[in-house]
């Protein structure tokens, strides 16, 4: 169960948060470094583990991905897990630590030498199944080495939002991911109500921009749950 994982020695004995726990063998979940103690420093660290529930990878840190911590664990529970280092097994790009991507189920380097010229890489996304492989779909997308060194413009192929220029995020488009604009005030947004629901979108939207949150539109409060319209709204 999830709780047995959270209380295992592997979790309790994680290295300090800033000491490279990400991808460490046995580090089922990462610890959180930014802690605010009353009257203390914002970035003090604490030793005990802090599970961080999530709905999708974008809600975790750059060195993490969102998944269930155990196979056959508590249904519906996903938390931020430490990213996988090079040569570790993976099922999607976000599982691999920055500087790596998922190819044939293994995290491989995306450094400059590896990406000299252009390469072809199969990109697929899981449609509501956290354990599907990346390589099960035959659509092929050409990735340029450029995307790993300059921030992608709108429409550029990406693996994660950090690949995209300011004001853009990396979102699913058909069976690849491209840089799309972060949503502005009044634009329709997607509120994920249940685990795995974001896996069904083949035209994924970005998140709302700074100062905005995705909320039910005021005049849609009386509508049925299925037809409620969410938009990016200012506080």
């Amino acid at each position: 169960t999830l709780n047995s994982v959270l209380n295992s020695n592997a979790i309790k004995n994680l290295p300090p948060p800033l000491g490279g726990a990400a991808g460490h063998p046995g580090s089922a979940v990462s610890a959180a470094p930014g802690i605010l103690y009353p009257g203390g420093n914002k970035y003090q660290t604490i030793d005990n583990y802090q599970p961080y529930p999530c709905a999708e990878d974008e809600e975790c840190g750059t060195d993490e991905y969102c998944a269930s911590p155990t196979r056959g664990g508590d249904a519906g529970v996903q938390i931020c897990l430490a990213c996988r280092k090079r040569r570790k097994r993976c099922m999607r790009h976000a599982m691999c630590c920055p500087g790596n991507y998922c190819k044939n189920g293994i995290c491989v380097s995306s450094d400059q030498n590896h990406f000299r010229g252009e390469i072809e890489e199969t990109i697929t996304e899981s449609f509501g199944n956290d354990h599907s492989t990346l390589d099960g779909y035959s659509r092929r997308t050409t990735l340029s080495s450029k995307m790993y060194h300059t921030k992608g413009q709108e429409g550029s192929v990406c693996l994660r939002s950090s690949d995209c220029a300011s004001g853009l995020c990396c979102a699913r488009h058909f069976w690849s991911k491209i840089c799309k604009p972060v949503l502005k005030e009044g634009q329709v947004c997607t509120k994920h109500r249940r685990k795995g629901s974001h896996g069904l979108e083949i035209f994924q939207r970005c998140y709302c921009g700074e100062g905005l949150s995705c909320r039910i539109q005021k005049d849609h409060h009386q509508a049925s749950n299925s037809s409620r319209l969410h938009t990016c709204q200012r506080h």
């Epitope: 948060p17 961080y52 999708e56 975790c60 840190g61 750059t62 685990k195 905005l212 949150s213 506080h235």
Partner: nanobody, 124 residues
Framework: EVQLVESGGGLVQPGGSLRLSCAAS????????MGWFRQAPGKEREFVAA????????VYADSVKGRFTISADNSKNTAYLQMNSLKPEDTAVYYC?????????????????WGQGTLVTVSS
């Protein structure tokens, strides 16, 4: 910066119930997860429960599972911790935590910011 204000703490008898509230304001647009932690006198702060606002998934510590329930009201930017069947060992300062771990904000790890805490005392 997210501001968090906890309320609902107090003195309760063993077996009793309390409901803690945590109102978030300020940089709330950055928050995707809310949590509760506690710190008993002379002990380390420990995780109690957390909830993801968009996916609704919840995580609990073994010591409170089945007794405590975490929930959130998005429209009020408020998280709650319903505590039932309270025991003397639940006595602690309870801290609300707001998680803004999104990689879009450049954090390498998911992280929490903290409120000032509210004292819960379980005693007869």
């Amino acid at each position: 910066e997210v501001q968090l204000v906890e309320s609902g703490g107090g003195l309760v008898q063993p077996g009793g119930s309390l409901r803690l509230s945590c109102a978030a304001s300020g940089g709330i647009y950055r928050v995707n997860t809310m949590g509760w932690f506690r710190q008993a006198p002379g002990k380390e702060r420990e995780f109690v429960a957390a909830i993801n606002w968009s996916g609704g998934s919840t995580v609990y510590a073994d010591s409170v599972k089945g007794r405590f329930t975490i929930s959130a009201d998005n429209s009020k930017n408020t998280a709650y911790l319903q505590m039932n069947s309270l025991k003397p060992e639940d006595t602690a300062v309870y801290y609300c935590a707001a998680g803004n771990g999104g990689r879009q904000y450049g954090h390498s790890r998911a992280r929490y910011d903290w409120g000032q805490g509210t004292l819960v005392t379980v005693s007869s």
